[in-house]
C-alpha cells in the first residue's frame, strides 16, 4: 500500500477511519459499517453509538467519528456527552419521582430543569424586597430599610468637593 | 440525502487512458473513506480500490495495481480514479461508494475496445 | 485472500415463499459479513451488515445469521420486488474486499 511504514509501530501508519489488521502484515482495513476509529493507529474500529427513543441523532456517526445524540423534544441532555435524557419541566416546576411538581412556597426554578432554589434572604445583605418572589422567579432586593427613611436618597451621593488650588493626585 | 454520481465513463481503445469522478453530496465527504467498485457486463462484483477520508491511505486490487491511481478533493467533495493502460477486461460499470459500502453511486460505463 | 462461496448460484421462488442463501467463507470472519442486493441496471443496496444487523430502511423480512464460516440470508416472505441478484461480502480481513459469486434469484 501507498503509505510510508512507521519503523517503530507499523499499526501507526493506519488512519482514522481503519484498523490495523496484525494478522496480515499491518494492513489497514476499512472499518465496517456502522463502526468507527478517530484516531490512527487503532487495532479495532467501535461500534457507532445509536441514538434511539428519546435521544435524537444530532450528528450522524461516520467512519472517522461517532455520533452525537441530543435529546427529543420535552427533555434535556445530562451527563457527559449527553448519556441520558432528562424530562423537561415547566418554569416554576422542578422533577421528582413522581413527576413534575410546582416549587413550594419559598422557592423558585426559572428554568426546564433542575431544582427548586430558596428564594434570597435580602435581609442577610441588609436589603428590603423590592419585587416579591414567585414560583418563577427569585425575589428581587431592593435598599435596605435605613436608606428608605424620609429625606433619605437612594442615589449614591456626590464626591465631596476639593479644595480650590488643588489638582487631582 | 446521500447521493454519490460518477462521471467520466467512455469507449477507449487499449492502451489509452480515462479519468472517472465521483461527486458526493449528503455527507461529510471528508470524514469517510471511498471505494471504487466495479461489474463487469453479466459478471459478479470485484473491488478495485481503496482511499483513506484523508487520502494518505490506498490499495488497489492486484489486477489494477501499477495502471490505476485513486485519488480524492475534499475541498470538492470528489473522489478521482486515473486508468491507464487499460485492457479489454477493464470494461465493466465502475460504482463508488462510501467506506462501509452502505451508499453506492448509479455507476458509470468503461468500454475498452478496438 | 479469504473466498467467499455462496450456493445456490440460482434459485427460483414464488410470492410469499421463505428463501434461504448461504455464504461460506474460507476461513472464519467471524461476525464480518455484509449483504447485498442488486437489480438489473441499479447499484448494490446493504441489506444486512455484521452478519445479522438490519440496515435503516430494510424491511424486517430480510434476517440475516450466522458466524465463523457460514452465513445466511432469509427472506421470511417473498415480495415480487425481491427478485433481484444477492452478494455476499466479508469485511473481516480487508483489503481486498472480496464479494461472494451471487445467487439470482428468480420468479418460478
Known amino acids: 500500500f501507498e503509505r510510508t511504514r512507521s519503523l517503530q509501530d507499523p499499526c501507526s501508519n493506519c488512519p482514522a477511519g481503519t484498523f490495523c489488521d496484525n494478522n496480515r502484515n499491518q494492513i489497514c482495513s476499512p472499518c465496517p459499517p456502522n463502526s468507527f476509529s478517530s484516531a490512527g493507529g487503532q487495532r479495532t474500529c467501535d461500534i457507532c453509538r445509536q441514538c434511539k427513543g428519546v435521544f435524537r441523532t444530532r450528528k450522524e456517526c461516520s467512519s472517522t467519528s461517532n455520533a452525537e445524540c441530543d435529546c427529543t423534544p420535552g427533555f434535556h441532555c445530562l451527563g457527559a456527552g449527553c448519556s441520558m435524557c432528562e424530562q423537561d419541566c415547566k418554569q416554576g416546576q422542578e422533577l421528582t419521582k413522581k413527576g413534575c411538581k410546582d416549587c413550594c412556597f419559598g422557592t423558585f426554578n426559572d428554568q426546564k430543569r433542575g431544582i427548586c432554589r430558596p428564594w434570597t434572604n435580602c435581609s442577610l445583605d441588609g436589603k428590603s424586597v423590592l419585587v416579591n418572589g414567585t414560583k418563577e422567579r427569585d425575589v428581587v432586593c431592593g435598599p435596605s430599610p435605613a436608606d428608605l427613611s424620609p429625606g433619605a436618597s437612594s442615589v449614591t451621593p456626590p464626591a465631596p468637593a476639593r479644595e480650590p488650588g488643588h489638582s487631582p493626585q | 440525502q446521500v447521493q454519490l454520481v460518477e462521471s467520466g465513463g467512455d469507449v477507449v481503445q487499449p492502451g489509452r487512458s480515462l479519468r472517472l469522478s465521483c461527486t458526493a453530496s449528503?455527507?461529510?465527504?471528508?470524514?469517510?473513506?471511498m471505494h471504487w467498485v466495479r461489474q463487469a457486463p453479466g459478471k459478479g462484483l470485484e473491488w478495485v480500490t481503496f482511499?483513506?477520508?484523508?487520502?494518505?491511505?490506498?490499495y488497489y486490487a492486484d489486477s489494477v495495481k501499477g495502471r490505476f491511481t485513486i485519488s480524492r478533493d475534499n475541498s470538492k467533495n470528489t473522489l478521482y480514479l486515473q486508468m491507464n493502460s487499460l485492457r479489454a477486461e477493464d470494461t465493466a460499470i465502475f460504482y463508488c461508494a462510501r467506506d462501509w459500502l452502505d451508499y453506492w453511486g448509479q455507476g458509470t460505463l468503461v468500454t475498452v475496445s478496438s | 485472500d479469504i473466498q467467499m462461496t455462496q450456493s445456490p448460484s440460482s434459485l427460483s421462488a414464488s410470492v410469499g415463499d421463505r428463501v434461504t442463501i448461504t455464504c461460506r467463507a474460507s476461513?472464519?470472519?467471524?461476525?464480518?459479513l455484509n449483504w447485498y442486493q442488486q437489480k438489473p441496471g441499479k447499484a448494490p443496496k446493504l441489506l444486512i451488515y455484521a452478519a445479522s444487523s438490519l440496515q435503516s430502511g430494510v424491511p424486517s423480512r430480510f434476517s440475516g445469521s450466522g458466524s465463523g464460516t457460514d452465513f445466511t440470508l432469509t427472506i421470511s416472505s417473498l415480495q415480487p420486488e425481491d427478485f433481484a441478484t444477492y452478494y455476499c461480502?466479508?469485511?473481516?480481513?480487508?483489503?481486498?474486499?472480496?464479494f461472494g459469486q451471487g445467487t439470482r434469484l428468480e420468479i418460478k
Open positions: 476461513q472464519s470472519i467471524s461476525s464480518y
Open positions: 449528503g455527507f461529510t465527504f471528508s470524514s469517510f473513506g
Open positions: 482511499l483513506s477520508y484523508d487520502g494518505s491511505y490506498k
Open positions: 461480502q466479508q469485511s473481516y480481513s480487508t483489503p481486498p474486499i472480496t
